[in-house]
Amino acid sequence: IVGGTNSSWGEWPWQVSLQVKLTAQRHLCGGSLIGHQWVLTAAHCFDGLPLQDVWRIYSGILNLSDITKDTPFSQIKEIIIHQNYKVSEGNHDIALIKLQAPLNYTEFQKPICLPSKGDTSTIYTNCWVTGWGFSKEKGEIQNILQKVNIPLVTNEECQKAYADAKIAQAMVCAGYKEGGKDACKGDSGGPLVCKHNGMWRLVGITSWGEGCARREQPGVYTKVAEYMDWILEKTQSSDGKAQMQSPA
C-alpha cells in the first residue's frame, strides 16, 4: 500500500496473507475470508506457481514479522481460478480458495460481506484498500498491515487513464487524480472494501495498475458484484450449500 498507515488489531478481520514456501517462505498476495472455508483472491497470484502443497494462508494476523514456524496456518484443499482468466490479461482476475479445514470466527478472523449480484446502483463513498504490499513501486513487503482510504472513480474516467487497455464492466477503479495513494505489488488479491449503511462490503479485489500511486493512473480491481453468480456456483457445487457472508 502506498501512502497508507498502520492498521490495528481486528480492524480488517477478513484480511488474509497468502504465502508460498518453496525454498524460503514469503508473502505473495492478500485475500479475503468470505466463509468458514473460503477465501477470495486474484487469479494472477497463482501465475507461474504450483496449485498445491506450497501455499500457506495466515488469518487473524496483523504483523507478518510475528509469524513463526509455530504460527497456525490454513492449507489449501482446492484452488478455483476463473475459467476465462488468461495470464497477462486483466480480465476475470478472480480465484476462490477452499481451505482444508473450516476456520472458527473470532474478533480478529471473520468474513467480509459480499455485495448483491450486479450491484450498480449503490454509491460507495467510504472505501479502503488494505495489504502488506510495497509502499513504493520498487519496494518491499511491509510487516504491519497497511490501510488507505481511496475514492472510487468511474469506469469512463478509468478508461481514459488506460487508453491501451480495456476497462471492462467487471472491473472497478479507485484512485486520486494526483496519485500518492494506491495498492501496490503484494497487495494483489486483497480487499477493496466500502462501508455503506454501517456495513462493510467487498467491492473489489486488488488486480492491476500502471505502476503504483502514479498521477492519473488509478488502481484497477475485479468488481466482485459481477462475479456473484460464479462465486455462489463454485462454492455451492463444492460445498453442497453456500456458506457465504451475504449482505443482510
Epitope: 508460498v20 518453496l22 505473495l28 507461474g48 506450497v54 520498487k138
Partner: antibody, heavy 122, light 106 residues
C-alpha cells in the same frame, strides 16, 4: 543438488522434427516453472519457451510460435520441447533451465543444464 | 516486446571496477537478472531481482536498476571474471535477454 540433463539434440534436415528432453533431479520438479533457452553458435542467449508447474500455461517466443511445443511430465520429472518445421536459423545449443517466477518479482533462471546441440542442415 | 541493449565489449584493468549496462524502455519498472557465461559453459545466475546475489556468487558482484538502465558492477575485477554477461528481464509473459557483453580483463 539441482541437476538438469538435456538430450535429444542432433543433426536434422530443414523441415524436419526433433524432440528434446530434460531430466530434472535434486528439487521438487512439479513446483517450478521450466524454461528453454537457446544459443546459436557465437551468438547470445535467446528465450524459446516456458511452462508453468502444472503445465496449464505455456509461452513462446515469436520466432518459434506455431512450430515448437513445450510440455512436461511431472511424474517423470521431465521437460520436453517438440520442434517441428525446423529451419537453419534454429541451429543452436538448447538449454533447459529451472525458473523462479511470480507476479511480484518476475522471472529468472537459477539453474541451467549443460545444453544439447541441434543442427539444422541439409 | 522491448529490446534490451548491452555494449558488445567492456574492458577493465585487474583490480578496477567493471560496469556493464543494459538499457531498455522503462527498464527500471521491471526486475532484471544477470548471467555470466564462460566459454564452453552454461550460463550462471549472478544477480536477480535487480540487486540480489545468489549465495554462491562473489560479493564483488552487485546490481542496480533505475529509469531505463540496469547496471552490473564487478569490483576488484579478476582474470577469472572474463566472460560474457547477459541481462534479462520479464515483461507481459515474455522473457527478454540483452545481446550480451564480453568482459575483457586487460
Amino acid at each position: 543438488e539441482v541437476q538438469l540433463l538435456e538430450s535429444g539434440g542432433g543433426l536434422v534436415q530443414p523441415g524436419g522434427s526433433l524432440r528434446l528432453s530434460c531430466a530434472a533431479s535434486g528439487f521438487t520438479f512439479s513446483w517450478y516453472t521450466m524454461v528453454w533457452v537457446r544459443q546459436a553458435p557465437g551468438k547470445g542467449l535467446e528465450w524459446v519457451s516456458y511452462i508453468y508447474p502444472s503445465g496449464g500455461a505455456t509461452f513462446y517466443a515469436d520466432s518459434v510460435k506455431g512450430r515448437f511445443t513445450i510440455s512436461r511430465d511431472n511424474s517423470k520429472n521431465t521437460l520436453y520441447l517438440q520442434m517441428n518445421s525446423l529451419r537453419a536459423e534454429d541451429t543452436a545449443v538448447y538449454y533447459c533451465a529451472m525458473g523462479s517466477y511470480d507476479y511480484i518479482w518476475g522471472f529468472y533462471s537459477d539453474h541451467w543444464g549443460q545444453g544439447t546441440l541441434v543442427t539444422v542442415s541439409s | 516486446q522491448s529490446a534490451l541493449t548491452q555494449p558488445p565489449t567492456v574492458s577493465v584493468s585487474p583490480g578496477q571496477t567493471a560496469r556493464i549496462t543494459c538499457s531498455g524502455n522503462k527498464l527500471g519498472d521491471k526486475y532484471v537478472a544477470w548471467y555470466q557465461q564462460k566459454p564452453g559453459q552454461s550460463p550462471m545466475l549472478v544477480i536477480y531481482q535487480d540487486t540480489k546475489r545468489p549465495s554462491r556468487v562473489s560479493e564483488r558482484f552487485s546490481g542496480s536498476n533505475s529509469a531505463n538502465t540496469a547496471t552490473l558492477s564487478i569490483s576488484g575485477t579478476q582474470a577469472l571474471d572474463e566472460a560474457d554477461y547477459y541481462c534479462q528481464a520479464w515483461d507481459s509473459s515474455i522473457v527478454i535477454f540483452g545481446g550480451g557483453t564480453r568482459l575483457t580483463v586487460l
